[in-house]
Structures are given as C-alpha cells and as structure tokens.
C-alpha cells in the first residue's frame, strides 16, 4: 500500500432522511464488486486518507425512470459531488442535472487531501437505483 | 509489460446476428487509434489476461439518431457491460439506457481476473455508430 | 516528473470569436482546482509534452439550459475533442451531441505524442457554463 495506490469503488446503501440530500455508500467484497483500499467510509461518506490527485467518477441512475419521469417533477434532479468536510475545504467538484435522462455519469481529476470527506448530494424528489451496475461512486489516486 | 500496465481501447467492428445482443469489437494501430496491450480479443469480445482492478469505460452512440429517434422505438435501448465468461463469474458491471439521448458514456472501477471475457450487450432495435470517435470501449489496469 | 505522470485538469476560460468553435481553457491553483503538471497551454489549447497513452476526459454543461433549450435551437450542439495540430495528426478523438440534455461527459484512452495540441470544438449557438464543477477538461498519462 506504500505505493499510494489508494482506490475505492462504492455501491449505494441508502438515501438520507428527508432534509439530507446526501447519498450513503457502502463497500466491500461481501457486498459484491465494491471495495475500499486506502480510503474509508465515515457514516456512509467517503474519506480520503492520502494526499494526491484523484480521478473521481460517479454514475447515478434514477429508479423506475423513463424519459418523461424527470420532466414530470417540478424540481430539477441534480447530482453534485463535493468536499463537505472539513468545512474550510468545502467545495463542489462535479455537478450534473438529469434533465430528460435517467442516468448521469461523469469523472474528473481533482486534488484531494487526507481527511477530505466527499459527499454526493442528490437534490430533487426521485429515488436513485440501488442496482450495483446502475449506481456507483469511486475514486482512484493517480499521482502525488 | 511486467509492470502490469495492461490496457486496451477498441472500436466497433459490427453488431451480432439478430438474436445476439453483443457488440463485436476490433483493435489495432492499422485500424486507427485502437490498441490492445495485454488484453486480447476472442471473436470480438475482450478477454482479460492479468488479475487486478481495472477502470472500464465505454461510449456508444446510436446511428442516425436525434432526440426523437429513441422515443420512436418501443423497446428501450440499453447498454450493459458485464463479464459473460467464465459462466461462474457472469455479472453485469455497468448498465445505461439511452432514453431520449443518442449517446451513453460511463466508466467504473472493477476487479477482473485472468480469463474474464467482457461482453457489451446492446438491447433494443437501433444500430450503433461505427465512427471511432463516437463508439469505443476500453479497459485500463490500475492496481493489483 | 521523470516518472512521466503528466496530468492536467482545466477549467473553461472563454469561448472563441464567432467563427471559432474552440473552447479556450485555463489552469492553475490560483484559479481553483485546475492544474497543469507536464502538459502546457498554448493560447488556451492543451499541448502534450510527453508521448504515451492518455486518458482524456471532458464534461461540458450548457449555460441557462433546460431540456427544451437544446431542442429549441436548430443547429445541433455538438462537442468534439481532437488533435488539431500538427495538421498531419489532425483527428477527432471523441464526439458527443447534447440532444435534449444540457451536459455531456465522456472519457477515452488514446495515444498522444509530444507536440499534439488538443482542441475542444463546441458547435451550435449555445454558451457553455464556466462553473468549474460543470465544465472541465483533463488528460492523464497512463503508460508509455
């Protein structure tokens, strides 16, 4: 592990209570193909344990969704990945809206520091799919 | 090659016969910007030759497509990437529907083992584009 | 840097003049979370300084956009990433249309050579968002 190849791929555990837009993640071989090798989970949120530049990627699919589902709902459904703690480093890293689609998927390179906790906020009133091939979130350390 | 940097980027060769939803891939410098360095092709399907965690990515664009094309067709057009052999390891890794769009693109980290053959199943009745900048599929070994 | 871990993540600076479809990028810690470590910017375009296979990724979000915005405009809005110079190596690497969506995001592996300049051409008449979590472009060297 001293090479710094920190890496994690997570699957959706559950959504938060009504006023909490965060998605709660889980990972580990017993759950399927998810894993944590370096980073760790803190109450369902991903915490970084090694400084560096990371590739962050995510896919979220809405449950029981058709192209009309997203347009039927007044509030736009948006997914934002950001650093939520420590508060001094709070920032949105990646943001996507579903519009008339049912899946968003993206990735980006970003510097992260030990202790950064990443949150994935799903705003709107549509439930995400928990299927492990439809909704997942991961990070990969790529260089110091 | 002993570093284990197995990597491949493939372009679409052709679709399967009517009852076979698999896409058939090809790769090699003579074909353009596709390549195989470690993994290999078995009858158009990608076979892994080294254990590890891989970043799998794909983009598929439908041919002669507009935002109304996908809604004109009754069966939803869906792309699934999975391990199709050996049968004991068969699983769907990544799945996306086109809904009212003409392109899907995503990526994920997943553990793969030597001998795993990845299949990309396009269900629905729309022909995918063969343009090399619109439809491609690749894997990258990232760590043991 | 001798390891060859060239990497860059850029944010949108501005669009080109009317007949120039290129997006102009900027990067550096003073600007936020963008950076250049190896590659360099030449008049807002990304120039590669080390041969190898790169993971290229991009996300572009249209400004003031709803699912009807893209369908209201006659010319389809398309994003193409390609090598634009040297002219002898000019090629489109990755292409996506927005259709009824407001964001495109994708990634691919491709061989790039020292001196290759990458251009990101946005055709259509819609302005892209300059928010750093909505529009970004990056490359990561992954192997020789």
């Amino acid at each position: 592990e001293s090479l710094g190849w920190d890496i994690a791929e997570l699957q959706l555990n559950h959504t938060g209570p009504q006023q909490d837009p965060r998605l709660y993640w889980q990972g580990g071989p017993a759950l399927g193909r998810s894993f944590l090798r370096g980073p760790e989970l803190d109450k369902g949120q991903l915490r970084i344990r090694r400084d560096g530049i990371y590739m962050v990627h995510i896919q979220v699919t809405l449950a029981i969704c058709s192209s009309t589902s997203t347009s039927r709902h007044h509030h736009p459904t948006t997914l934002a990945v950001g650093i939520c703690s420590p508060a001094s480093r709070s920032i949105s890293l990646l943001r996507l809206s579903f519009h008339q689609g049912c899946t968003i998927a993206s990735q980006r390179l970003t510097p992260l520091a030990r202790g950064d906790t990443l949150c994935t906020n799903l705003t709107g009133t549509l439930l995400p799919s928990r299927n492990t091939d439809e909704t997942f979130f991961g990070v990969q350390w790529v260089r110091p | 090659e002993s570093l284990g940097w197995d990597i491949a980027e493939l372009q679409l060769n052709h679709t399967g016969p009517q009852q076979d939803p698999r896409l058939y891939w090809q790769g090699g410098p003579a074909l353009g910007r596709s390549f195989l360095r470690g993994p290999e092709l078995d009858k158009g399907q990608l076979r892994i030759r080294r254990d590890g965690i891989y970043m799998v990515h794909i983009q598929v664009t439908l041919a002669i497509c507009s935002s109304t094309s996908t809604s004109r067709h009754h069966h939803p057009t869906t792309l699934a990437v999975g391990i199709c052999s050996p049968a004991s390891r068969s699983i769907s890794l990544l799945r996306l529907s086109f809904h009212q769009g003409c392109t899907i693109a995503s990526q994920r980290l997943t553990p793969l083992a030597r001998g795993d053959t990845l299949c990309t199943n396009l269900t629905g009745t729309l022909l995918p584009s063969r343009n090399t900048d619109e439809t491609f599929f690749g894997v990258q070994w990232v760590r043991p | 840097e001798s390891l060859g871990w060239d990497i860059a993540e850029l944010q949108l600076n501005h669009t080109g003049p009317q007949q120039d479809p290129r997006l102009y990028w900027q990067g550096g810690p003073a600007l936020g979370r963008s950076f250049l470590r190896g590659p360099e910017l030449d008049k807002g375009q990304l120039r590669i300084r080390r041969d190898g296979i790169y993971m290229v990724h991009i996300q572009v979000t249209l400004a003031i956009c709803s699912s009807t915005s893209t369908s209201r405009h006659h010319h389809p809005t398309t994003l193409a990433v390609g090598i634009c110079s040297p002219a002898s190596r000019s090629i489109s690497l990755l292409r996506l249309s927005f259709h009824q969506g407001c964001t495109i995001a994708s990634q691919r592996l491709t061989p790039l050579a020292r001196g290759d300049t990458l251009c990101t051409n946005l055709t259509g008449t819609l302005l892209p968002s300059r928010n750093t979590d909505e529009t970004f472009f990056g490359v990561q060297w992954v192997r020789p």
């Epitope: - | 002669i64 004109r72 009745t125 584009s129 063969r130 | -």
Partner: antibody, heavy 120, light 111 residues
C-alpha cells in the same frame, strides 16, 4: 413466416379517400416499424410514411396534409388512409416491414400491393 | 430531399457475364460509419425484394453473385455471373434521412 397481407378497394372516386389495411404475421408490430410506399409509371417508387413500433409516425412532407397511418398491435394491423385522391395518385400502394434495426430504414418484406385507380 | 440517379436506365447482358448498375446520390448518404444505401430487385407483377443493405451487406437468402459497393455519393450493384432469373428492374434507396427516396430504376435484360 413473415407476411404482410393488404386489403382495400382498388377503385376510388376523385376527391375521396383511400383506406388500406395491412395485416401482418410472423412478427410483432411492437418491435418492427411498417413503411408505406407507392409505385406509379410516372413517378416510380415514392416513400409515403412510416409507423414506428411505438405508434409514432413520420410522413413524407409532400403528403403530410392528407395522409394518416395508424395501427392496432393486438390485431397485427396497420391502417393507411390518404384523403383527396386525384388522378396523379393512381399507383400500386405497398406496405413493407422495416428490418430489425429501427434506424436502418430499409424494407425487407413487402405486401402484395394494392392497385389503386381514381375514377368516377 | 436526396435525389438518387441510376445509370444506365437499361442494359442487356449475356448469361454468365457481369452486370454493373450505378447509383449516384445528390449528397453523401454516409454517416455513423455506414453507407445508408440499399438495393432492391423487382420483377413484373411482384413487389420489390431487398438484395443489399448498408451498401454492401447481402440480405439473407440472396445469392452471393449479387454484391454492392461504394460510399459517400457513388454506389454500385454488381451481378456476376448473371443468370436468367436475374432479368428484372433494380432500384437503389437511401435512408440517410427522411424522406426516404428511390432511384428511377435500371432494367436488366438478357441478350
């Protein structure tokens, strides 16, 4: 096996409408689209319109004001109606199946044709 | 609309020889890595029959003596060796966009 059977009158009075039913077998209208094409000595083969598996239709702009295509999936029937026929609408009218790939827009199986004369 | 021009309007070929029919489109019918051009055969009193799709793909059940080639705006249907049952009219059709259009046809006769 795949078949498309057309039924409808061969004689239509000027300014009246033409109705043809295309009954299909060997495939489902929920999967395949059906095109309508006509053939006349003067104009050759002309594409008139298509009804997709979803029931959505596309028409040739030259006929859009007087053409209607609909279907009944449960009866495996496609209905073609053209209004205001004139002498230059004299032709053989065909229904034809779109191949499996919906965006291919070719025609792999054809009905036997309905020969239409416009006369009072 | 895309206009398809076929040539020749008619041709006479001896048994066993090669028949070549051309179809030129008023604009390219290539997109997405395919050429959206198809070929049909029609005999008197019968509907057209699909022979070739996407410029060069042989429809199931069609004899291998039929072949298609071309891209962009210029396409060719070849029949070799010509057999007696090949006497018919041949049409090209594009599907690059709506409306679909057909060529005017080429009548193949046997010498």
């Amino acid at each position: 096996q795949v078949q498309l059977q057309q039924s409808g009158p061969g004689l239509v009075q000027p300014s009246q409408s033409l109705s043809i039913t295309c009954t299909v077998s060997g495939f489902s209208l929920t999967t395949y689209a059906v095109h309508w094409v006509r053939q006349s000595p003067g104009k050759g083969l002309e594409w008139l319109g298509v009804i997709w598996s979803t029931g959505i239709t596309d028409y040739n702009a030259a006929f859009i004001s007087r053409l209607s295509i609909s279907k009944d999936n449960s009866k495996s029937q496609v209905f073609f109606k053209m209004n205001s026929l004139q002498s230059d609408d004299i032709a053989i009218y065909y229904c034809a199946r779109n191949p499996y790939y919906g965006n291919l827009n070719a025609m792999d199986y054809w009905g036997q044709g309905t020969s239409v004369t416009v006369s009072s | 609309d895309i206009v398809l021009t076929q040539s020749p309007a008619s041709l006479a070929v001896s048994l066993g020889q090669r028949a070549t029919i051309s179809c030129r489109a008023s604009k390219s019918v290539d997109t997405s890595g395919y050429s959206f051009m198809h070929w049909y055969q029609q005999k008197p009193g019968q509907p057209p029959k699909l022979l070739i799709y996407l410029a060069s793909n042989l429809e199931s059940g069609v004899p291998a003596r039929f072949s298609g080639s071309g891209s962009g705006t210029d396409f060719t249907l070849n029949i070799h060796p010509v057999e007696e049952e090949d006497a018919a009219t041949y049409y090209c059709q594009h599907s690059r966009e709506l409306p679909l259009t057909f060529g005017a046809g080429t009548k193949l006769e046997l010498k």
